[in-house]
């Protein structure tokens, strides 16, 4: 009764166990009784990632700079190119095939997280006491000025866009006339 | 240090049903195929059965078809062998042994060999 | 199944000697061959992989050749605690088999 299974390194072809080519590497031939399973090195701009038994390597990925993208990592014989984006863009899927600008935070919102090559742009509303009044995608919302460390009072109240505005604080309050 | 210990083994009616364990320690258990191979008192080695290292491939010699089971949980770094419908031949050490794939990239094919042996458990089948 | 017969079943050498052990396989292996030593009371182990590689912490006397259906080990020198037995096996195909084994007895 012939072999239905073999070991992690081999696969079954004609009721025998061949040995897999190594990553890197393509299947040029089977083995027989008598002779190893054959096998070629990639070509350059190819690979192969995993113990296979394929007869042509995979093409390394193309990272179309008109596409907004850039090498990350150069591919070797084992391993597929890597591509990331240009600075100031990020990838819109996990295989980084196309890139998009980052998001800029409007006024009203500051940087929760800044965008990096893989993800965009992370927004947050300014809460009460913070503000943010540009449009930017580094900005964090920023506390409002605290008017009573400089010795002022408030004149104008913050707001998530805008910051108090402080003024000196009224004399009358503190000098009381007495006729 | 690595390591693999047996247990289990012991005194069975015919008929009866037993199983092994095989403990490992002091490496990746779950990144290696395993086998179990048994010695009849004062025979020779018989290779019983192989599993891979996920657990979803399974062989076994024709002496033991349909009997035994082979199995692994990798979470508890532990290989099982049921052992059922047993016969006064199944009477022997079962040693649980590690197949480790030999490779040099500068070669152009690897090699299988069994690098780590249990120290062995007896298993007895008489009336 | 690929029988392995194994020859001689039992031989007789003084420390110093040469000895060669052959296995011979019913159909071709190519170099999927390992040979192992034992002791009694002991586990098996692991000589000789891939026919002629010498695993790790094996004293260089042991060495292994030959591929498809004929192979051989030899022990240049013996020592004294090469006196065991020992076997091949053929990882090529389901069902892997050993060889029937050959003592090495002290003469």
């Known amino acids: 009764e012939p072999p239905t299974a073999c070991r992690e390194k081999q696969y079954l072809i004609n009721s025998q166990c061949c040995s897999l080519c190594q990553p890197g590497q393509k299947l040029v031939s089977d083995c027989t009784e008598f002779t190893e399973t054959e096998c070629l090195p990639c070509g350059e701009s190819e690979f192969l990632d995993t113990w296979n038994r394929e007869t042509h390597c995979h093409q390394h990925k193309y990272c179309d700079p008109n596409l907004g993208l850039r090498v990350q990592q150069k591919g070797t014989s084992e391993t597929d190119t890597i591509c990331t984006c240009e600075e100031g863009w990020h990838c819109t899927s996990e295989a980084c095939e196309s890139c998009v600008l980052h998001r800029s935070c409007s006024p009203g919102f500051g940087v929760k997280q800044i965008a990096t090559g893989v993800s965009d742009t992370i927004c947050e509303p300014c809460p009460v006491g913070f503000f943010s009044n540009v449009s930017s995608a580094f900005e964090k919302c920023h506390p409002w000025t605290s008017c009573e460390t400089k010795d002022l009072v408030v004149q104008q109240a913050g707001t998530n866009k805008t910051d108090v505005v402080c003024g000196p604080q009224d004399r009358l309050r503190h000098h009381h006339h007495h006729h | 240090e690595v390591q693999l210990l047996e247990s289990g083994g012991g005194l069975v009616r015919p008929g009866g049903s037993l199983r092994l364990s095989c403990a490992a320690s002091?490496?990746?258990?779950?990144?290696?195929?395993m086998d179990w191979v048994r010695q009849a008192p004062g025979k020779g080695l018989e290779w019983v059965s192989y599993?891979?290292?996920?657990?979803?491939?399974?062989d076994y010699a024709d002496s033991v078809k349909p009997r035994f089971t082979v199995s692994r949980d990798n979470s508890k770094n532990l290989l099982y062998l049921q052992m059922n419908s047993l016969r006064a031949e199944d009477t022997a050490v079962y040693y649980c042994?590690?197949?480790?794939?030999?490779?040099?990239?500068?070669?152009?094919?690897?090699?299988?060999?069994?690098?780590?042996w249990g120290q062995g458990t007896m298993v007895t089948v008489s009336s | 199944d690929i029988q392995l017969t194994q020859s001689p079943s039992s031989l007789t050498a003084s420390v110093g000697d040469r000895v060669t052990i052959t296995c011979r396989s019913s159909q071709g292996i190519r170099s999927s061959l390992a040979w192992y030593q034992q002791k009694p009371g002991k586990p098996p182990k692991l000589l000789i992989y891939?026919?002629?590689s010498l695993e790790g912490g094996v004293p260089s006397r042991f060495s292994g050749s030959g591929s498809g259906t004929d192979f051989t080990l030899t022990i240049s020198s013996l020592q004294p605690e090469d006196f065991a037995t020992y076997y091949c096996q053929q990882l090529n195909s389901f069902p892997s088999t050993f060889g029937q084994g050959t003592k090495l007895e002290i003469k």
């Open positions: 002091g490496f990746t258990f779950g990144s290696y195929e």
């Open positions: 042994a590690r197949d480790v794939f030999f490779f040099d990239s500068s070669g152009d094919n690897g090699a299988y060999g069994m690098d780590v």
């Open positions: 599993i891979s290292s996920s657990g979803e491939t399974t």
């Open positions: 891939g026919g002629s």
